[in-house]
């Protein structure tokens, strides 16, 4: 049960062409479905059904993005095309450097992601819920450019840097 510290940077462009950045921190967990390591990339929101598509050429993004998937209540998708683990694999196959699942509506997904996998993905698969998930989805839903940095330990506070 390793905590994943996620830093999300939102880039807002101003009329003058400059960028303003907003940074927000949230916590999730590394699942056993993936590796417990740091990752960083531009956020790409993926619909759970979008990952069903077998034609990988159709929406192959440039490598190194972070996929964000909001899982729906199991009742709304009683016969999913892929398991949650399958969705994570599909995202990584398509070039994701990490996948973040919002499991707020689907707590059972946590068990699926944490089932002892003999062949875990080599990239991190993180899950978030509650207030952290709301924070993340609020940023993702703005449909602006945003980057996620996933870390294994908390980002250092400015006061924690030592003056050598």
């Amino acid at each position: 049960k390793e905590t994943a510290f996620v830093e999300v940077v939102l880039f807002e462009s101003s009329p003058s062409g400059d960028y303003t950045t907003y940074t927000t921190g949230l916590t999730g967990r590394f699942s056993r479905a993936g590796a417990t390591l740091s990752a960083e990339g531009e956020i790409v929101q993926m619909h759970p059904l979008g990952l069903c598509n077998n034609n990988d050429e159709e929406d192959l993004y440039e490598y190194g993005w972070v996929g964000v998937v909001k899982l729906e209540q199991p009742e709304l998708d009683p016969k999913p095309c892929l398991t949650v683990l399958g969705k994570a694999k599909r995202a990584v196959q398509r070039g994701a450097t990490a996948v973040i699942f919002d499991v707020s509506e689907n707590p059972e997904a946590i068990d699926q992601l944490n089932q002892g996998s003999e062949d875990p993905l080599k990239r991190p698969v993180v899950y978030v819920k509650g207030a952290d998930a709301i924070k993340l989805m609020n940023i993702v839903n703005k449909q602006k450019v945003a980057r996620a940095r996933i870390q294994h330990r908390p980002p250092r506070q400015p006061t924690e840097y030592f003056d050598m």
């Epitope: 921190g25 916590t27 819920k129």
Partner: antibody, heavy 116, light 110 residues
């Protein structure tokens, strides 16, 4: 690292009251802070939580009755229009830095008595 | 809306005995369940988080189990110092909540 509540006193019904939670040894920008109350002889009742000064969540019964706000070193709880049912010890607590949403660090509490 | 129901409300146990407290969530909360101990006149103290992980400094006679909607706190080899009220708390959601805490269980040690 510590948190301490203050501002609890005897107030008459309808008189707004603000409780203050003063923290030391850690930064509020890194932690969410919650308020919990306990009426005499009763159980713990969650009021709400504030995340890094900008996002607040309240128990459904507490919306409109309480306001949580934050400065750099304090977290305030305003009881907008106290009633006798608001008589309780009010605790401020720091949420853990993982996502267990447990409350790891608690203040000793401050007693609010609402009576005419 | 993730209501937490704790049973029993009160339990009496002899020194050295075992006490079991149950907590039920109205919806699945995975393993996001925390337990607290509160002694009279003191603030609550975190005992167990994530359903089964002991908080720092908590004796091993305390243990927690469960997942989904059913959870249990067990105190084995009860000591006089364990006389307190115990509360469960869901750590799943902060929205549309009446109370994240269960109603509490008073443990009386004979």
């Amino acid at each position: 690292q510590s948190v301490e509540e203050s501002g609890g006193r005897l107030v008459t019904p309808g008189t707004p009251l603000t409780l203050t939670c003063t923290v030391s040894g850690f930064s509020l920008s890194s932690y969410a802070m919650g308020w919990v109350r306990q009426a005499p002889g009763k159980g713990l009742e969650w009021i709400g939580i504030i995340y890094a000064g900008d996002t607040t969540y309240y128990a459904s019964w507490a919306k409109g009755r309480f306001t949580i706000s934050e400065t750099s070193t304090t977290v305030d709880l305003k009881i907008t229009s106290p009633t006798t049912e608001d008589t309780a010890t009010y605790f401020c607590a720091r949420k853990s830095d993982d996502d267990s949403d447990s409350y790891l660090l608690w203040g000793p509490g401050t007693l609010v008595t609402v009576s005419s | 809306a993730y209501d937490m129901t704790q049973t029993p409300a009160s339990v009496e146990v002899a020194v050295g005995g075992t006490v079991t407290i149950k907590c039920q969530a109205s919806q699945s909360i995975s393993s996001y369940l925390n337990w607290y101990q509160q002694k009279r006149g003191q603030p609550p103290k975190l005992l167990i988080y994530d359903a089964s992980t002991l908080a720092s400094g908590v004796p091993s006679r305390f243990s927690g189990s469960g997942s989904g909607t059913e959870f249990t706190l067990t105190i084995s080899g009860v000591q006089c110092d364990d006389a307190a009220t115990y509360y469960c708390q869901q750590g799943w959601s902060s929205t549309n909540i009446d109370n994240i805490f269960g109603g509490g269980t008073e443990v009386v040690v004979k």
